[in-house]
Every structure is written in C-alpha cells, then in structure tokens.
C-alpha cells in the first residue's frame, strides 16, 4: 500500500552540521546584509565517513517569464496573478571530486533535497530551525519508513501504444554523454489539490514544495538534455475543481477533461501534472497518458507519498517519462539501467521501490529520442522565456528586491529618512539607507571597523568607503599561524 501517512519518518540518519564555504570577497549584486541568496554557494557536509563538498548554483531556469499563480481569494473568487522579480533559494549543482555527481537543494530554511555520489543517493533535510548551519539529517531513501509505490500505467496499455520491445533498438551511448540534439523544454503547469493544500497548511508552503519538486525533476531530466520549466501553479486552497478520486485513472480522466475546458483561459503549457494529498488505491502513486506530450491529453497525476519532496519528484519524472513515450524498464528485453546501479534503480522502473531512482535507463533514452522524431513533439523545441526571479518586488515588505534601492516597510511604519517608503528608492541626496557602513544616509569612510574579530581565526572587517554594507565575513585559513 502506498503510505497512508504521507509524512513518513526516517529509520536511520546521520546528523550533520553543514558548513558554508566563504565566497570570494567580491561585491554581490545585492547587499549582503539583506541575507538574500547568492548566485553560487558551496557547503561542506561531513557524512558517511566523507567530507562532501557541494557546489551549487541558483536554478535561473526554474520559472517561465509568464509564470502565473492561481488560487481562491478570501471572498471566494478565483484569482490569477503574475508574480515578478523576487529572489529565490532553489539550487542545482554537483559534488566536488565526483564526475557524475548531481545535487538539487533548496536553501530557504536550512538545506533540503538530494545529492548523488556514485550509486548512492543521499537525502538531506533540517532537523531543527537552526538554518543552514543547524542540525541536518543526511540519509538514504531506503531509510525512509515507507513502502514501495507503483505506477498505475498498465503493461498492456504500454504494449499497444509502444509496439514490440526488444533490446536491438537500444544502442547505449558511450559514457554519460548528452544527446547531441538541441535542448528540449517542457513547459509545465502544476495543479495542487485541496488535500495537499490542507496537508501543507498554506499557499507559501505549497509554492515552496512545488518549486522544490520541479527543481528536482528538472535536475533529473538534464542528463537527457531536457529542461523542465514551471509556467503555472494552481493551488486549490478552497476546494477541488474536480473530483480527486482514490482511483488514479478516474482522477487522470477528470484532470484532462478539466484541462481541456480551461486551456483557453489558462497559461499555455506542454504538460499538466496534478500533485495530490489523496492516497491512491493500492500501491499506485502515479498515473499518466502515454506518448501524450504536446497533445490535449498531456498530463499525469501524482500522489505526494513521501515526507521528502524527492519522492513525488521521482514519481513526476516517471509519469512525465510516460507522457514522453517511455515504457517501464522491466518490459524491455535487455534494457540497461547502467551497470553500476542495481536493477530497479532507474526512473522508469514500474515500482519506485524503497530507494528513489536518480537516472534514466538506456531504453528510456532511446524511447525519448524516438518520440522526438514525431511531428507531435514540436512543442518541446521552443525555449520558453525564462523568468530570472520568482515572485514580484513588493515595496514595503522589508526586503530590497529587484528595482529597489531600499525598503523600510509600509509608509506608516518607515522611520528611515534615507528611504522613500512609497517608491523604495533612496531619498534625495542619500547615498544609502541600510547597512553597517551607512550612517546618516552616507557611506562611512574607508577603514572604519564594521565587524570586529569573533575569535583567533576570525578577521575584522572594515568599511571600504564605497559600499553601505560591511564586506562578507572572512577568516584566516586553517593552519595559518
């Protein structure tokens, strides 16, 4: 049975205290005192007898520029808004010293996500509210207390759609090289049902989880030279727009019927994925239309079956694989899920098993290339306009966002004469409004101490005379006398 308690717990984990490596001493695009998330960041994790160093880069391709959010307002009306301009905290990258490694994490409130090293998939999540430097659990998916989930797409339906499956067609590519074709893009619309909303408790929590999931799905597809870009999110915070049944095939039919009615007034997209908090019957956690990508039936339903978002991300990647014409690996004679991984570990395995998969098999890749030869797949060729930031700049929310020079809160609260609270621009004649090196609206002269030494290894920082913020905290390297 798919887990009826969706937030299962870990059976076995290691406690780690991530250590953020100091970045280069260069001016950042936004003031450091605002605590906004940097373009690149590295963390050292002491886990499983190793020190893993994760090098991460913000996923700037996570959202399309026309990204919309739809929800129900307090008065019961449906509202669609197009947030613009805020920063975000979803990263992708690799593990230093491991050539085929991958990492996909959010850093919004501690570190959460996965990193893959060789055949091991490590999951990480915060254990407390100590932020990125606090206690985190690092564990392997098999140590989540959950049972295996299966895909509801039947082998019979796959057979009739995909024809005979033999290994002859699947000539493995040398090494891990990407397909030589152009990058393809799936413009994704995600619908979150009321059960999932109730489980997570707020629109902000839903948005955070969906962005985390899509970030993971995108990372899984990058090895196929595919990008998954979120163009719309619909949250059923008040009530479901159609019946979400425990029978996944009924729910998929309802989703596709509803989508057909909505397409004219909803964001144009290549694929729709429902994330539900409903427990599907039996062991099924996902169901999809096979080879339906770019058609009106392009969609799938996914149960959020695991505490860790990597779980539903793997399910979504699998169901999207069916939309892209992929069969279950075990249906294909001679299908190779790279030999360094044991059988059943690839994304298109019929059962997700107790350990989350992290790659596509050779036959999945061949099915995909075959699907891309069809005229139907043309919708994947257009690169969407990519939004470079999530959410919109909100003047008055105490965060300096794109296009703002300062933000001291709503006009009735602002007591900072250096900042025009209605425009979030500097007041006339002001050089700065925030920061340790800003005094009386002017940047302090170079050489003024702005951060004293904390201990023997720390270095004191001084204002540089040009910027209102104190330079990033620096310290002597270990071993320096």
């Amino acid at each position: 049975i798919a887990p009826s308690r969706p937030w299962a717990l870990m059976e076995q984990y290691e406690v780690v205290l991530p250590w953020r490596l100091p970045g280069p001493r260069v001016r950042r695009a936004l003031p450091s005192h605002l605590g906004l998330h940097p373009e690149r960041v590295s963390y050292v994790l002491g886990a499983t007898g190793h020190n893993f160093t994760l090098h991460l880069r913000k996923n700037r391709d996570l959202l399309g520029s026309g990204y919309t959010e739809t929800y129900t307002a307090a008065n019961g009306s449906e509202v669609t808004e197009q947030p613009r301009g805020q920063d975000h905290c979803f990263y992708q990258g690799h593990v230093e010293g491991y050539p085929d490694s991958a990492a996909s994490l959010s850093t919004c409130a501690g570190l959460r996500g996965f990193f893959q090293v060789g055949s091991d998939l490590h999951l990480i999540e915060p254990l407390d509210e100590g932020g990125e430097g606090g206690r985190h659990a690092v564990y392997q998916a098999e140590h989540l207390l959950q049972t295996a989930g299966t895909c509801g797409v039947s082998d019979d339906s796959l057979g009739s759609l995909l024809g005979p499956r033999t290994a002859a067609v699947f000539r493995p590519r040398p090494g891990d090289s990407l397909p030589s074709r152009e990058t393809r893009y799936v413009e994704l619309y995600v619908v979150v049902d009321n059960a999932e909303f109730q489980m997570l408790g707020s629109e902000a929590a839903v948005r955070h989880r969906v962005l985390e999931v899509v970030n993971h799905v995108d990372k899984l597809y990058q090895k196929l030279n595919f990008r998954v870009v979120l163009v719309g999110l619909e949250i059923w915070n008040s009530q479901d727009r159609f019946h979400v049944s425990p029978d996944p095939s009924v729910t998929l039919e309802n989703l596709l019927t509803w989508q057909a009615r909505q397409r004219t007034r909803r964001h144009l997209h290549d694929n729709v994925q429902l994330i539900t908090g409903v427990d599907f019957t039996g062991t099924t956690v996902g169901f999809a239309r096979v080879s339906a990508m770019c058609s009106h039936s392009s969609g799938a339903v996914n149960q959020d079956h695991s505490k860790n978002p990597v779980g539903v991300a793997c399910t979504m990647a699998h169901e999207m694989g069916h939309n892209l014409g992929m069969d279950h690996d075990e249906n294909v004679q001679g299908c190779r899920c790279q030999e360094r991984f044991e059988a059943g570990r690839c994304i298109m395995a019929g059962s997700i098993g107790s350990s989350f998969p992290r790659m596509f098999s050779d036959c999945s890749q061949a099915y995909l290339e075959s699907f891309l030869e069809r005229p139907q797949s043309v919708c994947l060729a257009n690169a969407p306009d990519l939004s470079h930031l999530v959410g919109g700049p909100v003047c008055g929310n105490l965060f300096v966002e794109r296009g703002e020079q300062c933000d001291c809160g709503p006009p009735e609260d602002c007591r900072n004469r250096c900042c025009n609270s209605t425009t979030c621009q500097l007041a006339e004649g002001a050089q700065c409004a925030h920061g340790t090196c800003c005094q009386e609206c002017k940047v302090k002269p170079a050489g003024e101490l702005c951060r004293p030494k904390k201990d023997m290894c720390d270095l004191e920082e001084f204002c540089d005379g040009r910027h209102p913020e104190c330079p990033e905290d620096a310290f002597q390297e270990n071993g320096t006398p």
């Epitope: 307090a74 509202v79 905290c89 932020g131 629109e203 955070h208 008055g396 105490l398 809160g409 709503p410």
Partner: nanobody
C-alpha cells in the same frame, strides 16, 4: 483587525539564549512578511529579522549568525531564536505582520505590544 501576541521575553545572562514567539490571529489574508523589530531606551526602533512568504529571511549584520527567524504556517506564528546574547541586545522586541487583502492591494501593517528582553553582564 489582526492581533499579535508576543511571548518568551525575560532576563538572561550574557551568552545565553531566548526564544520569542508571536502568534497572529484575526483577519489574516495574504501575509507578505512577518518580522521582529526592537527598540532600546533612547534609540530608534530597528529591524532585527524578517521572513517573507517564500521563507526568504533578512537580518541586519548586528544579529546575523546569532538570531534565527522561523515560522509555523499552520499556526500563523513567527519565532525568533536568539543565541549568544549580549547586553547590547537589551530592548523591547516587537512583532510585526505585513499583509495584503488581495493581490496588488495596499500593504497593511500590524504590531504587537512588545516583550522586554534584558541581557545582564
């Protein structure tokens, strides 16, 4: 109207820790930001920590690395974990909620009554 009730203040020795809580109730719509500010005697009120609807956080340099803001979406509650406290952290700490009733409508701001934090040397 929105009500904000702070708790957790008190007297603590230098180097100690405190955890402040602020529970919001009433007509809550779309919260943009929840924040903590403080005001020491004879000084201007200053921002201590803020958390945005997407969990982005903002701290001034004076508390970065010592204070952590977090929230519980289910309970509309915001917390401030304060570690390595110094006498300079002595002040009245105020909870602040910034929300809007509909997308792009004007921001509304609400304040709690404040809770006293005293750090003795």
């Amino acid at each position: 109207e929105v009500q904000l009730v702070e708790s957790g203040g008190g007297l603590v020795q230098a180097g100690g820790s405190l955890r402040l809580s602020c529970a919001a109730s009433g007509n809550i719509f779309r919260i943009e930001t929840m924040a903590w500010h403080r005001q020491a005697p004879g000084k201007q009120r200053e921002l201590v920590a803020a958390i945005r609807s997407d969990d982005m956080t903002n701290y001034p340099d004076s508390v970065k690395g010592r204070f952590t803001i977090s929230r519980d979406n289910f309970k509309n509650t915001v917390y401030l974990q304060m570690n390595s406290l110094t006498p300079e952290d002595t002040a009245v700490y105020y909870c602040n909620l910034i929300q809007r009733r509909a997308p792009y409508s004007r921001l509304e701001t609400y304040w709690g009554q404040g809770t006293q934090v005293t750090v003795s040397s």
